[in-house]
């Protein structure tokens, strides 16, 4: 910790039920969301002249789940630099020593809305395919670093009015256990792949299932597999897609297999019926072709058996998506994760506190020495914007949405105030 840190650098402001003690450069804090990890505020960065999201992690070392997630998020946000993954602009703690250490503040790009709000808009094929393309680029970039998300959902994907998209978080740690028979905790499972729900092994295309669910929701305007718990989630999947083959059943653990095999047998519904023509945009003949391509992509992503499901690379080359293909985006060099043990780390709480503190200090040291870039490569709001000029901070603060935090509350936005104005 640098000796230069002093109280005069910070000020405190009450936000909902929490006190934000932030660097004075961040002004006009307005709450925009809250979730499992903490509260998020929109703010104006007076140094960069841009609007940002400030996320407070309160006592991130309070338990193993919080600690592991906070540490993992810090490490990955530092390493990952891709236009479809949210950028970390700053990290700080107002506490002066490790003994006093309580809170971490993450400053990130601020976007206009999350996908929950876009779902209620009627998107044309151009916008929809571009959003999906960006999702796939971001996912592919994470995969190239060995990060398999497993928990993609609309609330963790954010967009700007120019149709640009970013993934907010890094999903479930590799060590996070998911068990079909486990207690139904309050989390959104609608987008989790069968292999996650059923506690099977998984590979990269586990994330393709989630993209398929999100795409289906963008098309239909509602959640496509809305289960009340893991078991009901599985029921909703098989009711629509049909009971999987015996070949798939063999891959299940005995107890899960026993349950799954004893469910009623469903033949499944044809994709032409699940996603009929009339729910797609149909302004022109070209739209009809695009509708058929979109449905084909859905049918290849929403496949229960991961061994038969399309891969990320195949999805990027699918006719519906490939029109946007740019090697600089889809084949960006993989990030170098400096902590080789990141996914396997297990520690005493005291050790987590020290590790997280070191990460924060490392950032502060690097930024003090000018190593950390001042301006994001793809800033959320143009750097010459002021709060009055920017639509983001004004529009977003009035929405019940969450820009930089995993949230399980789906919020809607009237299509007339839609966050997607233009496309690339």
């Amino acid at each position: 910790m640098s000796d230069s840190k002093c109280d005069s650098q910070f000020y405190s402001v009450q936000v909902a039920d929490s006190t934000f003690t932030v660097l004075k450069r961040y002004q006009q804090l307005k709450p925009i969301g809250s979730g499992a990890q903490g509260i998020v505020c929109a703010a104006f960065d007076t140094v960069l002249g841009i609007n940002v999201a400030v996320k407070k992690l309160s006592r991130p070392f309070q338990n193993q789940t919080h600690a592991k997630r906070a540490y993992r998020e810090l490490v990955l946000l530092k390493c990952v630099n891709h236009k479809n993954i949210i950028s970390l602009l700053n990290v700080f703690t107002p506490q002066k020593t490790l003994e006093e250490f309580q809170d971490v503040y993450l400053v990130m790009e601020l976007m206009d809305a999350n996908l929950c709000q876009v779902i209620h808009m009627e998107l044309d094929h151009e916008r929809m395919s571009y959003l999906l393309y960006q999702m796939l680029c971001g996912i592919k970039h994470l995969h190239s670093a060995g990060i398999i998300h497993r928990d993609l959902k609309p609330s963790n994907i954010v967009v700007k009015s120019d149709c640009t998209l970013k993934i907010l978080d890094f999903g479930l740690a590799r060590t996070a256990c998911t068990n079909f028979m486990m207690t139904p905790y309050v989390v959104t499972r609608y987008y989790r792949a069968p292999e996650v729900i059923l506690g099977m092994g998984y590979k990269e295309n586990v994330d393709i299932w989630s993209v398929g669910c999100i795409m289906g929701e963008l098309v239909k305007g509602c959640v496509i597999f809305q289960g009340t718990d893991h078991i009901d989630q599985w029921n909703k999947v098989i009711e629509q897609l049909g009971t999987p083959s015996a070949e798939f059943m063999k891959k299940l653990q005995p107890t899960v297999r026993n349950y799954v095999e004893n469910r009623p047998k469903y033949p499944g519904i044809k994709f032409e019926e699940l996603f009929p023509d009339w729910i797609f945009p149909s302004e022109s003949e070209r739209d009809k072709i695009k509708t058929s391509q979109a449905r084909d992509l859905l049918s290849k992503m929403l496949v229960i058996d991961p061994d038969k499901r399309i891969s990320v690379d195949e999805a990027l080359r699918h006719p519906y998506i490939t029109v946007w293909y740019d090697p600089a985006e889809a084949e960006a060099p993989p990030p170098q994760i400096y902590d080789a043990q990141l996914e396997e780390r297990e520690h005493a709480i005291e050790e987590w506190k020290e590790l997280i503190y070191k990460e924060v200090m490392d950032w502060e040291e690097r930024s003090k020495n000018g190593v950390v870039k001042d301006q994001p490569s793809d800033a959320a709001v143009s750097s010459n914007a002021t709060p009055s000029q920017s639509s983001s901070i004004n529009d977003i603060s009035s929405m019940s949405t969450e820009q930089t935090l995993a949230s399980d509350t789906d919020s809607s936005l009237d299509a007339s105030t839609g966050p997607l104005e233009g496309c690339r």
């Epitope: 338990n63 520690h347 503190y357």
Partner: antibody, heavy 119, light 107 residues
Framework: EVQLLESGGGLVQPGGSLRLSCAAS????????MSWVRQAPGKGLEWVSG????????SYADSVKGRFTISRDNSKNTLYLQMNSLRAEDTAVYYC????????????WGQGTLVTVSS | DIQMTQSPSSLSASVGDRVTITCRAS??????LNWYQQKPGKAPKLLIY???SLQSGVPSRFSGSGSGTDFTLTISSLQPEDFATYYC?????????FGQGTKLEIK
């Protein structure tokens, strides 16, 4: 061979102080988080305090907070527990235990040192 | 604080028996659950960590299962040296807490 050897226990009057030590050998002491766990006569185990590998981060059970201080000297491979304002209910065998690397569990324990608080 | 409740508090069994001890946490602790064995006058010994992983050197007749709030320690075929007191312990958050113990006695 991993060894943890506690010392410093004994009879002390209520309100008195005592400093326990735990000498570690057979492993890289500075790489491991450590803890103190106690056991009152005929009772179960109670975690007392923990400390990170570098010693910067500590935590305590509510029952000892403000009275006990955990510390370590990595150059001496030694863990300490400074116990002040001792009470009769602090009477116990005090064990020093190492947190494993693979998982946060106490994988090695010392043989314990008895602290008796009585007038 | 997370409370750990073990049952039964004592148990009589014979050599060769299959024995099960349960431990319940007052809130979800994922798989941050460890089991220890303690014999009179001795320090505790780690048997199972992470709910189901067998500590090196511990006989395979010991096994653990569970996640969330409910956990089980099973001894498949009781041996004379297994008569002792067993404790569960959570390392999910501080203060780390132990169950009150289960004393396993010879019938």
């Amino acid at each position: 061979e991993v060894q943890l050897l506690e010392s410093g226990g004994g009879l002390v009057q209520p309100g008195g102080s005592l400093r326990l030590s735990c000498a570690a050998s057979g492993f890289t002491f500075s790489s491991y988080a450590m803890s103190w766990v106690r056991q009152a006569p005929g009772k179960g185990l109670e975690w007392v305090s923990g400390i990170s590998s570098y010693g910067g981060s500590t935590s305590y059970a509510d029952s000892v907070k403000g009275r006990f201080t955990i510390s370590r000297d990595n150059s001496k491979n030694t863990l300490y527990l400074q116990m002040n304002s001792l009470r009769a209910e602090d009477t116990a065998v005090y064990y020093c235990a190492r947190f494993g690397h693979a998982f946060p569990a106490f994988d090695y324990w010392g043989q314990g040192t008895l602290v008796t608080v009585s007038s | 604080d997370i409370q750990m409740t073990q049952s039964p508090s004592s148990l009589s069994a014979s050599v060769g028996d299959r024995v099960t001890i349960t431990c319940r946490a007052s809130q979800s602790i994922s798989s941050y659950l460890n089991w220890y064995q303690q014999k009179p006058g001795k320090a505790p010994k780690l048997l199972i960590y992470a709910a189901s992983s067998l500590q090196s050197g511990v006989p395979s007749r010991f096994s653990g299962s569970g996640s969330g709030t409910d956990f089980t320690l099973t001894i498949s075929s009781l041996q004379p040296e297994d008569f002792a007191t067993y404790y569960c312990q959570q390392s999910y958050s501080t203060p780390y807490t132990f169950g009150q113990g289960t004393k396993l006695e010879i019938k």
